[in-house]
């Protein structure tokens, strides 16, 4: 992939001077999935006409992926084997492990509004537990 940077830690920021941030981020909220399975992380930005210049997907302070308006997708090298871009601006996590449990963030960098951030909490369950219907309620 053409991205030419040695380290991808951290998150992003762009935005809009003086404009009101009218948009809202809708996410899948709290979700659970089986160990070994896959899950789609989705955020949707609505109620704004701002131009999306980049979307960053982060797990805590680790950058998973970037979707840039000019350059398309970049998946961080350490996640290449288990992260797939899409659908849309979402992200698919594969071969899930219990260590994947935690908070995930989508950061929509827009002009002129600024940065909109959405939060998703993922719990990866042992398959037997997941089969018995232990699920978080999506708010």
């Amino acid at each position: 992939y053409p991205y030419d940077v040695p380290d991808y830690a951290g998150g992003g920021g762009s935005g809009g001077g003086g404009s009101m941030m009218t948009g809202t981020i809708e996410t899948t909220g709290n979700i659970s999935a089986e160990k070994g399975g896959s899950i789609i992380l989705q955020c949707h930005l609505s109620s704004t006409t701002a131009q999306v210049t980049q979307v960053n997907w982060e797990q805590q302070d680790q950058l998973l992926a970037i979707c840039n308006a000019d350059l398309g997708w970049h998946i961080s090298p350490s996640f290449k084997d288990r992260v797939a871009p899409g659908p849309g601006l979402g992200l698919t996590l594969q071969s899930l492990t219990v260590n994947d449990t935690g908070e995930y963030f989508c950061a929509y960098h827009t002009y002129p509004d600024g940065t909109y951030t959405g939060r998703i909490f993922l719990e990866v369950l042992e398959s037997s537990v997941a089969e018995h219907g232990a699920r978080f309620q999506i708010p």
Epitope: Y3, G11, G15, G17, T53, P112
Partner: antibody, heavy 119, light 107 residues
Framework: EVQLVESGGGLVQPGGSLRLSCAAS????????MHWVRQAPGKGLEWVAF????????YYADTVKGRFTISRDNAKNSLYLQMNSLRAEDTAVYYC????????????WGQGTMVTVSS | DIQMTQSPSSLSASVGDRVTITCRAS??????LAWYQQKPGKAPKLLIY???TLQSGVPSRFSGSGSGTDFTLTISSLQPEDFATYYC?????????FGGGTKVEIK
């Protein structure tokens, strides 16, 4: 090694024009957004303009909007700033700076070129 | 525009001292703050981005913290090469704006 070299500065009269250039080397220029930032003598830093890697996003500070034009030629690894209707308050060192890929801060800067607007 | 206020505007310190510089944004910028070092006649150098992430090649004596409106740059043990002016910059919103700078001088 990442290198950014500005040129084109000089003395110009109020109302005049100047075109600054920034020659980039040591990285894949076409993958990076680029900024112009200026610094008036003895003062702090002021962001001037930004252009994304493929030129689809171009933004200006209000102080230069309508007078300055940022552009780039990825085939020539070059960034430009066309400055028209120059004013005394535009006197500054002008830096080109590369934007980090993962977010919009400036990770490499050129040495700067001095622009003096005076009659 | 978001105003960035740095304090102090200047300070005197000795080699080995722990130095703290603060930066306050006029509204929340989440974690999106960068710190730069500038020496006389030279271009700024990126030290910290995204509030607390150390730029590659920057010594570990530099650290950043904070989120929302209040941020701190700390130099744990000041070295001779650290005497310079330090600027904060928000990268959450256009236009990107810088603090007024903090000059760190030799005591």
């Amino acid at each position: 090694e990442v290198q950014l070299v500005e040129s084109g500065g000089g003395l110009v009269q109020p109302g005049g024009s100047l075109r600054l250039s920034c020659a980039a080397s040591g990285f894949t220029f076409s993958n990076f957004g680029m900024h112009w930032v200026r610094q008036a003598p003895g003062k702090g830093l002021e962001w001037v303009a930004f252009i994304s890697s493929g030129s689809s996003s171009i933004y200006y500070a209000d102080t230069v909007k309508g007078r300055f034009t940022i552009s780039r030629d990825n085939a020539k690894n070059s960034l430009y700033l066309q400055m028209n209707s120059l004013r005394a308050e535009d006197t500054a060192v002008y830096y080109c700076a590369r934007m980090r890929l993962d977010y919009y801060a400036m990770d490499y800067w050129g040495q700067g070129t001095m622009v003096t607007v005076s009659s | 525009d978001i105003q960035m206020t740095q304090s102090p505007s200047s300070l005197s310190a000795s080699v080995g001292d722990r130095v703290t510089i603060t930066c306050r944004a006029s509204k929340s910028i989440s974690k999106y703050l960068a710190w730069y070092q500038q020496k006389p006649g030279k271009a700024p150098k990126l030290l910290i981005y995204s509030g607390s992430t150390l730029q590659s090649g920057v010594p570990s004596r530099f650290s950043g913290s904070g989120s929302g409106t209040d941020f701190t740059l700390t130099i744990s043990s000041l070295q001779p090469e650290d005497f310079a002016t330090y600027y904060c910059q928000q990268h959450n919103e256009y236009p990107w704006t810088f603090g007024g700078g903090t000059k760190v001088e030799i005591k």
